[in-house]
């Protein structure tokens, strides 16, 4: 487990001719915020995939009003880092998408309006625990400067956050075959995966799945200190020494969750369930209204027009929590019958059926499907003695072995060409057209029919403004 951290240094006009118009004006003040989306690996097939490694939204930046006649300067930025926690190993190679959003603060009916100002994407190789990596990306006439790093959350260490560390049992050296844990030289590498929840500070293991306690600690997860003094109400001897058991300091002791959040222990740390109006790792972000966009994963925000009234997030299927921040493991209900494999795709459940079975939940026994497999989560459907595959989203062909083309819906208008780039589909417009989907004609005088062209969008610009 660990955290990917992104620090935005500046967002403003890039070098070269054609400086963009300021996105804000005296009539229409605005402020910026950023969204980062991370995907593991370098797969070209990830074009339309969700942010499987995680996503994060920044706070809103300071309100900015353009000075009349002045060129667009570097725009004021939100404070702080964007942090994307990752639960499993850091993949080492990843794809990113960073979006710059503009929140217009004029007199719009129904609150502020949001529009995507710029979108950059890239593929990078990055080891966890390394220094900050600096980057510059350009989107049209805009330039984004930022730094990023991945760091492990204790007790994980290493370039992939897969090695675990524990305190040394002896002051001078680590056990046989174990190295010191850089940069924590007073700790030793623990190569084994101990029992889930085994205290990283007070427990260790010599066999996978066990949890042995260091001197002075007891309990199945070594979270309970052994009192060597006499006790008023002893609870029984410990397995290590005879003494009294006192509840040890667990991750939820002292309740790290602010603002009335409730704490629950997880195998490696804790998780806060926040009351409405608060969110963040420790429920520390407050005064939230629907204008702040608190609902994640496509949740719909209702109510909460001012900071004193609560908002409610209506979550899409597959997500729960006061901010739709938690993915529901709907496969735990075992909805797939006849030995089918359950796939939770986020937007839908899919059952990958064994040969001979079909249907949304593998409920149909099909003789003509016996021995005929549909690949990639497709289901076999009976069709008058011949087998036919109903393919999962993103796949096609007779046996669902062909990856469906994000360009199949012909999203680029007026003869524009669509390309299935790893960062998302890209349109290259035919001469005379422009826009994200080549939807706007370019007039002979060079003007476009764009009602209010996003800054930096020029004739022939590719899809970068969604």
């Amino acid at each position: 487990a660990g955290v990917f951290e992104l620090q935005i240094h500046s967002f403003g006009p890039g070098p070269g001719p054609g400086a963009p118009r300021s996105p804000c004006s005296a009539r229409l003040p605005c402020r910026l915020f950023f969204r980062v989306c991370l995907k593991p690996g370098l797969s070209e097939e990830a074009a339309e995939s969700p942010c499987a490694l995680g996503a994060a939204l920044s706070a809103r930046g300071p309100v900015y009003t353009e000075q009349p006649g002045a060129p667009a300067p570097d725009l004021p930025l939100p404070d702080g880092l964007l942090q994307v926690p990752f639960r499993d190993a850091w993949p080492g190679t990843f794809s990113f998408i960073i979006e710059t959003w503009r929140e217009e603060l004029g007199d719009q009916i129904g609150g502020p309006a949001w529009s995507l100002l710029a979108r950059v994407a890239g593929r990078r190789r990055l080891a966890a625990g390394g220094p900050w990596a600096r980057d510059i990306q350009r989107a049209g006439a805009w330039e984004l400067r930022f730094s990023y790093r991945a760091r492990c959350e204790p007790p994980a260490v290493g370039t992939a956050c897969t090695r675990l560390c524990r305190p040394r049992s002896a002051p001078s050296r680590c056990g046989p075959g174990l190295r010191p844990c850089a940069p924590l030289e007073d700790e030793c590498e623990a190569p084994l995966v101990c029992r889930a929840g085994c205290s990283p500070e007070h427990g260790f293991c010599e066999q996978p799945g066990e949890c042995r306690c260091l001197e002075g600690w007891t309990g199945p997860l070594c979270t309970v200190p052994v009192s060597t003094s006499s006790c008023l109400s002893p609870r029984g001897p410990s397995s290590a020494t005879t003494g009294c058991l006192v509840p040890g300091p667990g991750p939820c002791d002292g309740n790290p969750c602010a603002n009335g959040g409730s704490c629950s222990e997880t195998p490696r740390s804790f998780e806060c369930t926040c009351p409405r109006g608060f969110y963040g790792l420790r429920c520390e972000v407050s005064g939230v209204t629907c204008a702040d966009g608190p609902c994640f994963n496509g949740g719909l925000c209702v109510g909460g027009a001012d900071p004193d009234s609560a908002y409610i997030c209506h979550c899409p299927p597959g997500f729960q929590g006061s901010n739709c921040e938690k993915r529901v493991d709907r496969c735990s209900l075992q909805p797939c019958r006849n030995g089918g494999l359950c796939l939770d795709l986020g937007h839908a459940l899919r059952c990958r059926c064994r040969a001979g079975f079909a249907g949304p939940r593998c409920e149909h026994d099909l003789d003509d499907c016996a021995g005929r497999a549909c690949a990639n989560g497709g289901t076999c459907v009976e069709g008058g003695g011949a087998h036919r595959c109903s393919c999962a989203l993103g796949f096609g062909g007779r046996d669902c072995r062909e990856r469906a083309d994000p360009c199949a819906a012909r999203p680029c208008a007026h003869g524009g060409r669509c390309y299935a780039h790893f960062s998302g589909l890209v349109c290259a417009c035919a001469p005379g057209y422009m826009g994200a989907r080549c939807e706007f004609p370019v007039h002979p005088d060079g003007a476009s029919a764009l009602p209010a062209a996003p800054p930096g969008l020029r004739p022939g610009d590719p899809q970068r403004y969604l």
Epitope: R138, E402, R403, R417, Y419, A420, A428, A430, P431, G460
Partner: antibody, heavy 119, light 110 residues
Framework: QVTLRESGPALVKPTQTLTLTCTFS?????????MGWVRQAPGQGLEWMGT????????DYASWAKGRVTISVDSSKNQFSLKLSSVTAADTAVYYC???????????WGQGTLVTVSS | DIQLTQSPSFLSASVGDRVTITCQST????????LSWYQQKPGQPPKLLIY???NLEIGVPSRFSGSGSGTDFTLTINSLEAEDAATYYC??????????FGGGTKVEIK
């Protein structure tokens, strides 16, 4: 493993038509790409010849290649091909096939095949 | 016809030097930044270094960087290494689905 591999004759006589084939693996033409041909005469620079867009199989050629070059696709064999008519000694070159998936760059290249035009 | 002019066509530099190669187009590339840079060593196909004017391809050392927009672009090698001896090409993509390559810059280590 995503790969491209060129094949064809190593020696062609002047005035003949050169036919080269690029066999691809690890991806299918159900996605939209430009599949292109680029050549490089000995000791010279790279020269784009033309591309075929797999979305609708439309073709585009360098101005010098129009009328001499034809690019086509056989998706059932995972191949696309180049025909260059009326070859001369000036067409002696290493011929590369390459794939474009957006933002204008060729991200995947074959190893190239040397074709010599000589009588 | 569109022309991409690279300069210099040849340069000799020492290990550790900062090297700059420029690429000038007679027409603006598509989207103002659809320009890429390749490295080619003898007997090998070109290897992509930079795409979209400034994006570093995965696995390419960070000493390589690209900049520019419209018609003028630059490839910079911040601290030249012996393994960087090669020929470097710029390549643009243009409205009308047209590609073009620069003439190349041969980099030699002194």
């Amino acid at each position: 493993q995503v790969t491209l591999r060129e094949s064809g004759p190593a020696l062609v006589k002047p005035t003949q038509t050169l036919t080269l084939t690029c066999t691809f693996s690890g991806f299918s033409l159900s996605s939209s790409y430009d599949m292109g041909w680029v050549r490089q005469a000995p000791g010279q620079g790279l020269e784009w010849m033309g591309t075929i867009y797999t979305g609708d199989y439309s073709t585009d050629y360098a101005s010098w290649a129009k009328g001499r070059v034809t690019i086509s696709v056989d998706s059932s064999k995972n191949q696309f091909s180049l025909k260059l008519s009326s070859v001369t000694a000036a067409d002696t070159a290493v011929y590369y096939c390459a794939r474009h998936t957006g933002y204008g760059y060729f991200g995947l290249w074959g190893q190239g095949t040397l074709v010599t035009v000589s009588s | 016809d569109i022309q991409l002019t690279q300069s210099p066509s040849f340069l000799s530099a020492s290990v550790g030097d900062r090297v700059t190669i420029t690429c000038q187009s007679t027409e603006s590339v598509y989207g103002s930044d659809w320009l890429s840079w390749y490295q080619q060593k003898p007997g090998q196909p070109p290897k992509l270094l930079i795409y979209q004017a400034s994006n570093l391809e995965i696995g390419v050392p960070s000493r390589f960087s690209g900049s520019g927009s419209g018609t003028d672009f630059t490839l910079t090698i911040n601290s030249l290494e012996a393994e960087d001896a090669a020929t470097y090409y710029c390549q643009g993509y243009y409205s009308g689905y047209i590609y073009a390559f620069g003439g190349g810059t041969k980099v030699e280590i002194k």
